[in-house]
């Protein structure tokens, strides 16, 4: 806390300008009116205040707005935003996308801080859902943002917002997240033709069920191995050798390089060796010829 001391004669600030950088902490506290500061927040960024001086300015705003800053002040916080704690930010009501962008710009190039995470959380909760414009903005600043959300939070993403998602935005998503996003993507892209549809849906296929993979295998999509390796193992296992061959097209030869990685390894174990041999890739580990395959899951369903 800065002690309350009277402002020396002639030092009362009439506006926020460069002369204030020469003020000591106690002079800033005594001579800068909080209301003036609030109305001229946009000027603070252009003045090279020290961190200690910024602490004083923050203290003045905290006193003026104990219940939380108004959006008109928040939008112009600039580098003062870096002084805010998550507790400060929880008091805010940020509704403007422009305000959000302005504050994200301050933190640009850095990891998502607890302050930014709290700000985004407040903003999204205030909007009720993650709309396309918000998602566009957040993924532009933080490509991994989408994958930082829980499946429950992702369920509030409307299918229309999926158009804003780029492949790199999904790089760090796990299967549970893709399980939520895939049906939304399928709905969002449903009116596209075959090849265009595949280009858009490809990044989401880690959440696709077997029947959708079977359908894709009939469309000459030529899925690459990087995409195939991200598919759910339980979705890949029921595919036949012929279906995988159609799904991968010319990329089928890549199965050899990945034969010990999931899901390829588990899929190989489910295929007849003579079916695998038809690929001519030297894949080993299939069911030997002459062995009977019992589908126990089917047996359980019948009993």
């Amino acid at each position: 806390e800065v002690e309350k001391t009277a402002c020396p004669s002639g030092k009362k600030a009439r506006e926020i300008d460069e002369s204030l950088i020469f003020y000591k902490k106690w002079e800033l506290e005594a001579c800068v009116d909080a209301a003036l500061l609030a109305t001229q927040m946009d000027r603070v960024n252009a003045i090279p205040f020290t961190y200690e001086q910024l602490d004083v300015l923050k203290h003045k705003l905290d006193e003026l707005y104990p219940q939380g800053y108004p959006e008109s002040v928040i939008q112009h916080l600039g580098y003062l935003f870096l002084k805010m704690s998550p507790e400060d930010i929880r008091k805010w009501n940020v509704t403007s996308l422009e305000t959000l962008k302005a504050l994200l710009e301050v933190n640009k190039g850095h990891e998502m801080s607890p302050q930014v995470a709290t700000l985004i959380d407040r903003f999204v909760k205030g909007r009720g859902q993650l709309d396309k414009d918000t998602l566009d903005t957040l993924t532009a600043f933080y490509p991994g943002y989408l994958c930082s959300l829980s499946p429950e939070e992702l369920s509030s993403v409307p299918p229309s917002s999926i158009w804003a998602v780029r492949p790199q935005d999904l790089d760090t998503c796990d299967p549970r997240q893709l399980d939520v996003l895939y049906p939304k993507a399928r709905l969002a892209f449903q009116n596209m033709n075959g090849s265009e549809y595949f280009v858009k849906i490809q990044s989401f296929l880690g959440g696709a069920p077997t029947e959708d993979l079977k359908a894709l295998s009939q469309q000459n999509v030529s899925m690459d191995l990087a995409t195939f390796m991200k598919l759910r193992t339980d979705a890949v296992l029921p595919l036949t050798v012929a279906e995988v061959q159609k799904l991968l097209g010319p990329h089928v030869e890549g199965l050899k390089a990945e034969e010990r990685h999931r899901p390829v390894r588990d899929w190989i174990l489910r295929q007849r060796q003579d079916d695998l041999d038809t690929l001519g890739l030297g894949l080993q580990g299939g069911i030997p010829n002459g062995y009977l395959v019992l589908d126990l899951s089917m047996q359980e369903a019948l009993s």
Epitope: D224, M229, K230, G254, L255, A257, E259, H261
Partner: antibody, heavy 119, light 108 residues
Amino acid sequence: EVQLVQSGAEVKKPGASVKVSCKASGYTFTDYNMDWVRQAPGQGLEWMGDINPSTGGTIYNQKFQGRVTMTEDKSTSTVYMELSSLRSEDTAVYYCARRRIGTGYFDVWGQGTTVTVSS
Amino acid sequence: EIVLTQSPATLSLSPGERATLSCSASSSVISSYLSWYQQKPGQSPRLLIYRTSNLASGIPARFSGSGSGTDYTLTISSLEPEDFAVYYCHQWSSFPYTFGGGTKVEIK
């Protein structure tokens, strides 16, 4: 420009562990496996294993099974190779090498990390 | 595991001469799964040829590869000063992946 940058040289005592990092840049990290290959002084190349950065799935050469652990951090596009219970014959240059998923050849290599095991 | 034996261990030639390097596998290797690397002293290996005969990006046309089954060859049609190095063959047809012991091409 595609680059694999490895951590610096290490000197370890027998029985200790070493963890080497390999930071990737200039390409889509999850489209390529990362393999580790070592080379003892004046010797040839020896494949140790690989990791799929997308799934975290690993395959290890049986020779190193139980001693080697490969991990990834997608947020920093970095892979790690940890080798435990070090012995003098583990003295070598350790390379990370990029391998496009679905191929078996290494098109980009790290600069190598020298690990010396000596009492 | 498949053992790759490279011969000769050392090849002494002059610039402009033709170099023929052999790689013999202990059991059959599918030709798509064999590649060659070049390594110079103090440097990392560099991919030269993949799938037995495909030239990697940026590799001059004087390098070529051939072979099938258990016998593979790397040929350098006319040696340049920068070609003097160690060459390794590598297979990923069978687990674990293995490299040959290397052939050193040195200046005569």
